[in-house]
């Protein structure tokens, strides 16, 4: 960067060289080049010179004024005209920030998305801060007292094995900058309370001809978690509005679930699954389309294979994904 | 790719315990699925025995209950299978496996033979 | 316990016949039948979970089928490498149960 080059003098911010968006600022150049009684000495902001707000303190030093700094990252730098010089010399440069301090870190939630082998915690760290920002996530064995910190940028995954003080944690988040520092409230956890089983993936569809046609959503995850607790939902791809359903889940085999549709119509679906009583929810699957076939349905496509279903004509959709992928996104 | 292999004595005493180890790599034991203990036979009947699940929990074929114990070391990546109190009975080849979810055991070990006899 | 019964200890076939292995469960598994296949010194093999879902890498000659207590599984054109004992496993709940093998045999 910028800080890199050698100077022949010194530049400085004054309140600071990271301070507060929207402060007035000034920044100071001082030359020290030999054989050199500087004519003028000029100010450059990412490359472009100033024209405004300089005044020249003695013969070796100037200052260039900033009312309300609103740019997160600049590079400055300043030069000298000296006489029988034709071009002018570089004195020195700095890169200046600005931001805010960080806000109390809140809605700390530490999750174990099953088949991990981490739990992941996250937190809404408020408004952006435009500086470098650290979080130190501070988790605590109510067991054994025994305390770790893990430093992150973000959110941070923490090895299951390294939590060896038992099951119940006391979790929070420090959030430090050049700025400021605040401290998150405390989160209590039990591991075995905020598992997220394996994702629920819908597999295929087929819409069975019968007195009164109905659909059927092929549908399975790979949890380990006997009590699961699934819903899901569907609409009309023209509607805004979804349909719910509920399920209480086994998964010791693939999932099928029955809607009766109206025929000829696009139909999008989703599920999402919670162990039994627990917090926190899968994200919802992907988009699962399936049209439904018009009253004398028409074979479109051919599952990968079934021999449940003996007789009546099936309109088949498949999905892309597999059974046993494991997709994760937000926290539901 | 994941693996799995057996080890322990070929031969036991009746009436001493049986103590057996499955190695697993290419998957950590402490990550996911329940890791199980099957044995076989000499006529081919398999029958489950029991699991560790990933959270080290353990479930047990309730006609072993009383003598079976499943323990594990994580640093290790390794699982293991106690049987107390062994008779002739208890003479078979011994599979450790991995379980698709809460379905079928996708992943077994090449299995270990093991004779009951004084 | 459930039990699982396979009726046929033997099942003799020829190359490129099809052939159906049945197994009956002593009460509803729903469709949480596993099938496996195990050549002689092997260890059992997954080809089928929940009745009638091939496992990965499973040729698409192997099929499974029913629900409740029924249950079928078919090849539809044997291969000499088929030649092995098939068991089917209930993985509706513990203890988990086998069937007790059928042998298919070449005639």
């Known amino acids: 960067g910028i800080t890199n080059i050698n100077c022949s003098g010194h530049i400085w911010v004054e309140p600071a060289t990271i301070f507060k968006m929207g402060m007035n600022i000034s920044i100071y150049c001082q030359a020290a080049i030999k054989n050199c009684q500087p004519r003028k000495l000029h100010f450059y902001k990412n490359g472009i010179k100033e024209r405004f707000q300089i005044t020249r303190i003695n013969k070796t030093t100037a200052r260039l004024w900033y009312k309300n700094f609103l740019e997160p990252h600049a590079s400055m730098y300043c030069t000298a005209e000296c006489p029988k010089h034709f071009q002018e010399t570089l004195i020195c440069g700095k890169d200046i920030s600005s931001g805010y301090p960080p806000d109390i870190p809140d809605e700390v939630t530490c999750v174990i998305y099953e088949y991990s082998g981490n739990m992941t915690c996250t937190w809404n760290a408020g408004k952006l801060t435009y500086i470098d920002t650290k979080y130190v996530v501070h988790v605590k064995s109510l067991e054994t007292e025994e305390e770790q910190q893990y430093l992150t940028s973000s959110y941070i995954n923490i090895s299951t094995d390294s939590l060896q003080g038992g099951k119940k944690y006391l979790v929070w988040v420090q959030a430090a900058n050049a700025l400021g520092m605040e401290e998150s409230k405390q989160l209590q956890i039990h591991l075995d309370d905020i598992v997220i089983p394996s994702a629920a993936v819908i597999s295929r569809a087929e819409t069975i001809n019968a007195t009164v046609p109905k659909t059927i959503i092929y549908w399975d995850s790979q949890t380990t978690i006997e009590k699961v607790s699934c819903e899901m939902r569907y609409k009309a791809t023209t509607n805004q509005t979804w349909n719910v359903k509920e399920f209480d889940t086994n998964f010791t085999y693939v999932q099928q679930s029955e809607f009766y549709l109206e025929p000829n119509i696009k139909y999008v679906f989703q599920v999402r699954c919670q162990e039994t009583g627990k917090r926190y929810w899968q994200p919802w699957s992907s988009l699962f389309f399936h049209k439904t076939p018009e009253t004398v349905p028409q074979v479109t496509s051919k599952a990968f294979q079934h021999d449940t279903w003996n007789s009546g004509l099936t309109v088949a959709s498949i999905s892309t994904g597999h059974l046993t992928s494991d997709n994760r996104g937000d926290i539901g | 790719q994941v693996q799995l292999k057996e080890s322990g004595p070929d031969l036991v005493k009746p009436s001493q315990s049986l103590s057996l180890t499955c190695t697993v790599t290419?998957?950590?034991?402490?990550?996911?699925?329940?890791w199980h203990w099957i044995r076989q036979f000499p006529g081919n009947k398999l029958e489950w025995m029991g699991y560790?699940?990933?959270?080290?929990?353990?479930i047990y074929n309730p006609s072993l209950k009383s003598r079976i114990s499943i323990t594990r070391d994580t640093s290790k990546n390794q699982f293991f299978l106690q049987l107390n109190s062994v008779t002739t009975e208890d003479t078979g080849t011994y599979y450790c496996?991995?379980?698709?979810?809460?379905?079928?055991?996708?992943?077994w070990g090449q299995g270990t033979s093991v004779t009951v006899s004084s | 316990d459930i039990v699982m019964t396979q009726s046929h200890k033997f099942m003799s076939t020829s190359v490129g016949d099809r052939v159906s292995i049945t197994c009956k469960a002593s009460?509803?598994?729903?469709?949480?039948v596993a099938w496996y296949q195990q050549k002689p010194g092997q260890s059992p093999k997954l080809l089928i979970h929940?009745?009638?879902y091939r496992y990965t890498g499973v040729p698409d000659r192997f099929t499974g089928s029913g629900s409740g207590t029924d249950f079928t599984f078919t090849i539809s054109s044997v291969q000499v490498e088929d030649l092995a004992v098939y068991y089917c496993?209930?993985?509706?709940?513990?203890?988990?149960?086998f069937g007790s093998g059928t042998k298919l045999e070449i005639k």
């Open positions: 929940s009745a009638s």
């Open positions: 560790i699940h990933y959270s080290s929990g353990t």
């Open positions: 496993q209930q993985h509706y709940t513990t203890p988990y149960t």
């Open positions: 290419g998957y950590s034991i402490t990550s996911g699925y329940n």
């Open positions: 496996a991995r379980q698709l979810g809460l379905k079928a055991m996708d992943y």
């Open positions: 009460q509803d598994v729903r469709t949480a």
